[in-house]
């Protein structure tokens, strides 16, 4: 027993259990297909511990493997209005350094109107994760509707 | 070596992995929107660590961050037939305490028959868990297709 | 601070992280509808901790209970395409030992080409997992589109 | 630089129809929707419905669902309205417009296409 | 439909000094964490120009002294320091829902 209380008063850091859930702050300007996010509990049920924003895009601060997940739901949307626009897309990757840019999970709505989805993917200190969403329909600003996290599970 | 082994006889409640996953058990009456759920290994395949059932609906017995997840697919459902019914939506959120009610996650099945996903969450002890599901078409009860689970993450 | 180190050097293994992600190898011949996977940093970003692959389909090395996760796009796919060559399944069970055989997880495509979810279930030591997609679409092979990985949550 | 380039005026009699169009340039036709606007003399404005150019399918106001059908062609990257069964109180100026990112709000517009209906 | 109405009809401010413009919606155009509310100005012989969307942002290349500001049924643009060149008619527009309506727009002119 007293071992479990030992490691409660560890800090959580330096068990690496890095975790994000950020909500939706808003798109980009006109050639920037990047959505931008916003967390920490002023604004509601998003936090960070760990991950840290840089403008809006979500930095890794600790190696390991993350399961990261999404959830986008298009505003003011239904089967028709989505057929009737542009294919849109969503796609989560790495977008910085450079050196690491890869797309990690790509979504096509076709005629729904949200996608979700999740995957465990390596991830190193520094990696920054973009979400881009292309397509002429506003992503919902609602935090039960679009949102996009991390959580550390291993080294 | 003596360190695992004595780890792992440390209860598993103590290191605060609370987790459930619950199968349909059934809808509500007239005007009640949820759906009841039921788990416990003389079911199948669903379970409660932690979390209990309260009424058919998911208590939380631990603080923390959760992951929960759900999908729910729609029976007897073609795309046809879901978009003649739209909508049908799907909202899973904490409805007790009252003091603490909002919404979590809420997806909408528009031509499609089945909804899926995930998010992290932070939910306190005594928290209850809704899923409510508007529309006039039955869930499926088929434990691969309709099932609702919560998983502890961190403090 | 001194545990944190001494945890950090106790094998992975002994801490029950099994953790597998793995990517879209190749379909199966003609009565055969599972999908044979591989995974290994030489291949990108899949990767297997713990559970093996038999065969192309994924074997689990540690009893527990498991978060499975899976995404499947269907090549070359369009709305109009999905529902003129409906219907497509994919399901996700156990096929080995033949006594524990079951369906863990099954989803239809409908009017859309890409599914994505996720479960708890307990797993054996053992336990074969086998991903089934019938229909006559062929998925995508891309790694960001179709992946398919478990996480070991507790005992 | 995006440019929607509309056809000329036109004098219609009652009852005829008129074809109008909104060629399209600086950008990939098939990806934004074309909405048309119109603007009777010295009243407000009106939306009359839109196109997307991707596969044809179009949306009209009620209004003038039963006189009105746009079309597009891919190969001139142009977009055409036309209305039928034409009164005077159609006399108006029509414009072709596009959205600049996200649709609802129209950031680039054609020069607009006097037509009058008169007998 | 969703009727859009925009008062005053017609406003005459003195160069430099503030206008403010009003448009009330039948119903709400707020949702999704957004307000489908925009703004244009259009002067004679031309084309509407847009200056807000969503309420309150800003077009790229409009002067900042045009902001946007309102939620739900009730909105207003404000034209913070009035310039020669603002004279003309002022629009705004709703894309709750289809069909998308216009206000019957108000005409600002110089005292």
């Known amino acids: 027993q007293r071992f479990a209380q030992a490691q409660q008063q560890l800090p959580l850091e330096s068990l690496g259990w890095d975790v994000a859930e950020l909500q939706l702050n808003h798109t980009g300007p006109q050639q920037d297909p990047r959505l931008y996010w916003q967390g920490g509990p002023a604004l509601g049920r998003s936090f960070l511990h760990g991950p840290e924003l840089d403008k809006g895009q979500l930095r890794i601060h600790r190696d390991g493997i993350y399961m990261v997940h999404i959830q986008v739901t298009l505003a003011i949307c239904s089967s028709t209005t989505a057929s009737r626009h542009h294919p849109t897309t969503l796609a989560v990757g790495i977008c910085s350094p450079a050196s690491r840019s890869i797309s990690l999970l790509r979504l096509s709505f076709h005629q729904g109107c949200t996608i979700a989805s999740q995957r465990l993917t390596p991830l190193a200190r520094g990696d920054t994760l973009c979400t881009n969403l292309t397509g002429t329909l506003l992503p919902s600003r609602n935090t039960d509707e679009t949102f996009f996290g991390v959580q550390w599970v291993r080294p | 070596q003596r360190f695992a082994q004595a780890q792992q006889q440390l209860p598993l409640e103590s290191l605060g992995w609370d987790v459930a996953e619950l199968q349909l058990n059934h809808t509500g009456p007239q005007q009640d929107p949820r759906l009841y759920w039921q788990g416990g290994p003389a079911l199948g395949r669903s379970f409660l660590h932690g979390p209990e059932l309260d009424k058919g609906q998911l208590r939380i017995h631990r603080d923390g961050i959760y992951m929960v997840h759900i999908q729910v697919t729609l029976a007897i459902c073609s795309s046809t037939t879901a978009s003649r019914h739209h909508p049908t939506t799907l909202a899973v959120g904490i409805c007790s305490p009252a003091s603490r009610s909002i919404s979590l996650l809420r997806l909408s099945f528009h031509q499609g028959c089945t909804i899926a996903s995930q998010r992290l969450t932070p939910l306190a002890r005594g928290d209850t868990l809704c899923t409510n599901l508007t529309g006039t078409l039955l869930p499926s009860r088929n434990t691969d297709e309709t099932f609702f689970g919560v998983q502890w993450v961190r403090p | 601070q001194r545990f944190a180190q001494a945890q950090q050097q106790l094998p992975l293994e002994s801490l029950g992280w099994d953790v597998a992600e793995l990517q879209l190898n190749h379909t199966g011949p003609q009565q055969d509808p599972r999908l044979y996977w591989q995974g290994g940093p030489a291949l990108g970003r899949s990767f297997l901790h713990g559970p093996e692959l038999d065969k192309g389909q994924l074997r689990i090395h540690r009893d527990g209970i498991y978060m499975v996760h899976i995404q499947v796009t269907l090549a070359i796919c369009s709305s109009t395409t999905a529902s003129r060559h409906h219907p497509t399944t994919l399901a996700v069970g156990i096929c080995s030992p033949a006594s524990r055989s079951i369906s863990l997880l099954r989803l239809s495509f409908h009017q859309g080409c890409t599914i994505a979810s996720q479960r708890l279930t307990p797993l054996a030591r053992g336990d074969t997992l086998c991903t089934n997609l019938t229909g006559t679409l062929l998925p995508s092979r891309n790694t960001d589109e179709t992946f398919f990985g478990v996480q070991w949550v507790r005992p | 630089e995006v440019q929607l380039v509309q056809s000329g005026a036109e004098v219609k009699k009652p009852g005829a129809s008129v074809k109008v169009s909104c060629k399209a340039s600086g950008y990939t036709f098939t990806t934004y929707n074309i909405h048309w606007v119109r603007q009777a003399p010295g009243q407000g404005l009106e939306w009359m419905g839109d196109?997307?150019?991707?596969?044809?399918?179009?949306s009209y106001n009620q209004k003038f669902r039963d006189r009105v059908t746009m079309t597009r062609d891919t190969s001139t990257s142009t977009v055409y309205m036309e209305l039928s069964s034409l009164r005077s109180e159609d006399t108006a100026v029509y414009y072709c417009a596009r959205f600049s990112r996200f649709d609802g709000w129209f950031a680039y517009w054609g020069q607009g296409t006097l037509v009058t209906v008169s007998s | 439909d969703i009727v859009m109405t925009q008062s005053p009809d017609s406003l005459a401010v003195s160069l430099g000094e503030r206008a403010t413009i009003n448009c009330r919606a039948s119903?709400?155009?707020?949702?999704?964490?957004?307000?489908?509310m925009h703004w244009y100005q259009q002067k004679p012989g031309q084309p509407p120009k847009l200056l807000i969307y969503l309420a309150s942002n800003l077009e790229s290349g409009v002067p900042d002294r045009f902001s946007g500001s309102g939620s739900g049924t009730d909105f207003t643009l404000t034209i913070s320091s009035l310039q020669a060149e603002d004279v003309a008619v002022y629009y705004c527009q709703h894309s709750r829902e289809l069909p998308y309506t216009f206000g019957g727009g108000t005409k600002v002119e110089i005292k």
């Open positions: 119903r709400s155009v707020s949702t999704s964490g957004y307000s489908y």
């Open positions: 196109i997307y150019p991707g596969n044809g399918d179009a």
